[in-house]
Interface confidence: low
């Protein structure tokens, strides 16, 4: 009779993570009598996966009933596959011996490859805010995928970015892989509503890539522009001085009025108006009684925005001549008036 052969018909098996892998093995003869064992890897360091004779292998089930005397099918199923299960599996026939069974013949091996989905990409931006015209870096990370082949793209508002560097680790063979990419993005004044998107495509995702996003509102700081104007009010001896703070982001802003260098009033931006581009406008005013004032007054609007060094704009208030209208107040959402008499 022909000597027993151990047949593993599948050179390779490809399984998605979480699914069940079936590893096929058949023998060509019932002789010699003895059990089958399954191993991952070969040589002295091989890992026992299943022993027909003894042991507890909760993830492994046999395809056929190995207790039947005429059984020659030693195929097994391994449940809930993870990338760590990848490797070459050998079906090994043992010959009954005393005191121990003796290894008789091994199958050629079946390579189990695991397709594992990448984790949702996590996009992180710079720790500190930056102003328009500056270039900032964003990173994107995704982990745990297999096989190694993966595609990563960056987008800003739907436009694909080209200035990025991507690494997939490790370089050599591994049960699963990670991807890390850094993209450079130039900020513009219109970027408050912008988004940066990292898109990862992988064979396991059925053509539906995973996306991670970062809002540039977390990254950008748009410094304000200031304009100080005066205009007469009905009472001839009163002047309304306004400080218009335009196009700033984020909202955190403190304004201080100075009269001839002395602090007159400090207030925090509250009832701001939002522009279409996501930046804010705000206005503060000062009501000045000039009738009792002999000398010219230098009024300064000083603004500290988002913890940055203060910027200011000054206006010289002429008290000798009758005040003329200088500029117009276009903001309707005034934050309230503060009447101040200068003595």
């Amino acid at each position: 009779e022909e000597e027993l052969q151990v047949i593993q018909p599948d050179k390779s098996v490809l399984v998605a993570a979480g699914e069940t892998a079936t590893l096929r093995c058949t023998a060509t003869s019932l002789i010699p009598v003895g059990p089958i064992q399954w191993f991952r890897g070969a040589g002295p360091g091989r890992e026992l996966i299943y022993n027909q004779k003894e042991g507890h292998f909760p993830r492994v089930t046999t395809v056929s009933d190995l207790t039947k005397r005429n059984n020659m099918d030693f195929s097994i199923r391994i449940g809930n596959i993870t990338p760590a299960d990848a490797g070459t599996y050998y079906c090994v026939k043992f010959r009954k011996g005393s005191p121990d069974d003796v290894e008789f013949k091994s199958g050629a091996g079946t390579e189990l490859s695991v397709r594992a989905k990448p984790s949702a990409p996590v996009v992180s931006g710079p720790a500190a805010r930056a102003t328009p015209q500056h270039t900032v870096s964003f990173t994107c990370e995704s982990h745990g995928f297999s096989p190694r082949d993966i595609t990563l793209k960056w987008f800003k508002n739907g436009n694909e970015l080209s200035d990025f560097q991507t690494n997939v680790d490790p370089v050599g063979e591994s049960v699963s892989y990670s991807i890390h990419s850094t993209a450079k993005v130039v900020l513009t004044r219109e970027d408050v509503h912008s988004q940066v998107i990292c898109e990862v495509a992988h064979v396991t995702l059925q053509g539906d890539p995973l996306r991670g996003t970062a809002n540039l509102s977390e990254t950008i700081r748009v410094p304000p522009t200031l304009e100080v104007t005066q205009q007469p009010v009905r009472a001839e001896n009163q002047v309304n001085v306004t400080c218009q703070v335009r196009k700033f982001y984020p909202q955190r802003l403190q304004l201080t009025w100075l009269e001839n260098g002395n602090v007159s009033r400090t207030e925090t931006a509250s009832t701001v108006t939002e522009n279409k581009d996501g930046t804010y406008n705000w206005m503060s005013w000062l009501l000045v009684n000039v009738s009792a004032h002999r000398d010219d007054v230098k009024l300064t609007c000083q603004v500290e925005h988002d913890g940055q060094p203060a910027v200011s704009k000054s206006h010289d208030l002429k008290v000798s001549a009758h005040p003329k209208e200088q500029g117009s107040n276009t903001a309707a959402e005034n934050t309230g008036s503060n009447e101040r008499n200068i003595y």
């Epitope: 018909p9 390779s12 079936t22 397709r115 082949d149 495509a201 053509g207």
Partner: antibody, heavy 122, light 107 residues
Framework: QVQLVESGGGVVQPGGSLRLSCAAS????????MSWVRQAPGKGLEWVAS????????YYADSVKGRFTISRDNSKNTLYLQMNSLRAEDTAVYYC???????????????WGQGTLVTVSS | DIQMTQSPSSVSASVGDRVTITCRAS??????LAWYQQKPGKAPKLLIY???SLQSGVPSRFSGSGSGTDFTLTISSLQPEDFATYYC?????????FGGGTKVEIK
Amino acid sequence: QVQLVESGGGVVQPGGSLRLSCAASGFTFSYYGMSWVRQAPGKGLEWVASIWVDGSSKYYADSVKGRFTISRDNSKNTLYLQMNSLRAEDTAVYYCARGVETYSGPNWFDPWGQGTLVTVSS
Amino acid sequence: DIQMTQSPSSVSASVGDRVTITCRASQGISSWLAWYQQKPGKAPKLLIYAASSLQSGVPSRFSGSGSGTDFTLTISSLQPEDFATYYCQQAIYFPITFGGGTKVEIK
């Protein structure tokens, strides 16, 4: 010998439905991933959908997603393609194809069935 | 989606000629490429898979090579039964995509 035989094709109006079947024989059906590939008259091949051995994972081309459903009955050795909301551009010969390797994802296709013609026309 | 571009779209050759068809992927696909032969009115037939592995029963005059983005199917000595249309196909990313085909005609 290994054989795949498609059926269920025919003429249908736009918006209509059809169900294609693919009867498999000569191999252990439950060991293989299966797919549908179509070919419009005079055109090239277009992958439509694939299904894992146990039906747990299904994959679709964007052009049919939400309209077509691939399924299998391993006890009957049969693969199905339920086609709803059919459009003129779905007119094609539909082939059923088997994966080459057992317990493998949809990658290489062999053998293929002889194909069944689906015509969507008013 | 990965675009598969085949060239030439058609080639005229004689029996005994060496014929080479190329296929280019729009991005790297490692070795996940197959070649198929299709004759008029017939279903496609797998010739090569994994870029260079010859499918069982396919004559050895067919060979495949390449990796990454550029692949080649070579028929070393064209036989009368080889006049057909040949397609490449990538199998690593969904959606699975085919090349536009190359028709090998009799000169």
